[in-house]
């Protein structure tokens, strides 16, 4: 808390400029009008104030706006944003994406701070959903943003926002997160033609069910092995040898190198050896010829 002292003669600030960096903390408090500061916030960022001086400027704004700053001030906070507490930010009503971008820029390249997390939370709640433009902005600043959200939070992402998602934004998502995102992507891209659709849906396929993989196998998509290895094991197991061959196209040869790894390993164990032999890859471990396969899970479901 800065003591209230009278401003020395001739030191009253007429505008926010470089001369203020020579003011002591008490002089800033006494000689800078809070309303002037609020209208000229855009200048503060260009002036090399010390952290202590920024504390005084924040204090002046807090006194002027005890209920929270207006957006016109928030948008131009610049480095003063780093001085804000989550409690300060909870008082704000940020509706403009430009304001959000301006404040994210201040924190760029650094881990998400409590201030930024609070700001994003306030912004998204204010909009009612994580819309496309917001998601676009957030993933530009924080590439791992989507994959750091819980499945419950991801379920509030509307399908239209999926257009903003780049493959690299999903690189580190786990299967549970992809289970939530895949149906949204399927809905978002449903009107695209075969090859274009596959390019868009490919990074979401870790959440795809068996029936969708079967459908893709009829479309000459030539899925690469890296994508195949990320598919849900339970979705791959019911696929026939012919379906996997169609799904992978020329990449089917890559199965040999992955035969000891999931989901390939588990899939091989479910196939007839005769069928596997038709691939000519030397895959071993299938069901020997003449053996009867009982699906006990189906039997349990019927009883």
């Amino acid at each position: 808390e800065v003591e209230k002292t009278a401003c020395p003669s001739g030191k009253k600030a007429r505008e926010i400029d470089e001369s203020l960096i020579f003011y002591k903390k008490w002089e800033l408090e006494a000689c800078v009008d809070a309303a002037l500061l609020a209208t000229q916030m855009d200048r503060v960022n260009a002036i090399p104030f010390t952290y202590e001086q920024l504390d005084v400027l924040k204090h002046k704004l807090d006194e002027l706006y005890p209920q929270g700053y207006p957006e016109s001030v928030i948008q131009h906070l610049g480095y003063l944003f780093l001085k804000m507490s989550p409690e300060d930010i909870r008082k704000w009503n940020v509706t403009s994406l430009e304001t959000l971008k301006a404040l994210l820029e201040v924190n760029k390249g650094h881990e998400m701070s409590p201030q930024v997390a609070t700001l994003i939370d306030r912004f998204v709640k204010g909009r009612g959903q994580l819309d496309k433009d917001t998601l676009d902005t957030l993933t530009a600043f924080y590439p791992g943003y989507l994959c750091s959200l819980s499945p419950e939070e991801l379920s509030s992402v509307p399908p239209s926002s999926i257009w903003a998602v780049r493959p690299q934004d999903l690189d580190t998502c786990d299967p549970r997160q992809l289970d939530v995102l895949y149906p949204k992507a399927r809905l978002a891209f449903q009107n695209m033609n075969g090859s274009e659709y596959f390019v868009k849906i490919q990074s979401f396929l870790g959440g795809a069910p068996t029936e969708d993989l079967k459908a893709l196998s009829q479309q000459n998509v030539s899925m690469d092995l890296a994508t195949f290895m990320k598919l849900r094991t339970d979705a791959v197991l019911p696929l026939t040898v012919a379906e996997v061959q169609k799904l992978l196209g020329p990449h089917v040869e890559g199965l040999k190198a992955e035969e000891r790894h999931r989901p390939v390993r588990d899939w091989i164990l479910r196939q007839r050896q005769d069928d596997l032999d038709t691939l000519g890859l030397g895959l071993q471990g299938g069901i020997p010829n003449g053996y009867l396969v009982l699906d006990l899970s189906m039997q349990e479901a019927l009883s």
């Epitope: 650094h110 881990e111 998400m112 701070s113 409590p114 997390a117 957030l138 924080y142 590439p143 791992g144 943003y145 994959c147 750091s148 959200l149 819980s150 499945p151 419950e152 939070e153 580190t172 786990d174």
Partner: nanobody, 116 residues
């Protein structure tokens, strides 16, 4: 600088239990997902389980569902994996993974060997 350290690995008999811990030092903040992955002797890294920042909801790979339990203490930046009814196929190096909006941090791993 964020550091992730796993502990608790070891040799255990089939059917036995083990508890792995993961500690995170440095500032990573509230919004993060913590995961366990494992790398088998055949060199495949596979996802095991996740615990999410919001509400502490969890997710498990089918191969460990019902046997493993993931939990976290956000105040201490700690996560653990309680592994029960261990099988020989659970033998692997177990890695802790911390996903923030900006980065992914990995630990060095802890070896779990299930053998009689």
């Amino acid at each position: 600088e964020v550091q992730v350290v796993e502990s608790g690995g070891g040799l255990v008999q089939p059917g036995g239990s083990l508890r792995l811990s993961c500690g995170v030092s440095g500032s990573i903040l509230a919004l993060n997902t913590m995961r366990w992955y494992r790398q088998t002797p055949g060199n495949q890294r596979e996802w095991v389980a996740s615990i999410y920042s919001s509400g502490g909801s969890t997710g498990y790979a089918d191969s460990v569902k019902g046997r493993f339990i993931i939990s976290r203490d956000s105040a201490k930046n700690m996560m653990s994996l309680q592994m029960n009814s261990l099988k020989s196929e659970d033998t692997a190096v177990y890695y802790c993974n911390v996903q923030t909006p900006l980065n992914v941090y990995w630990g060095q791993g802890t070896q779990v060997t299930v053998s009689s």
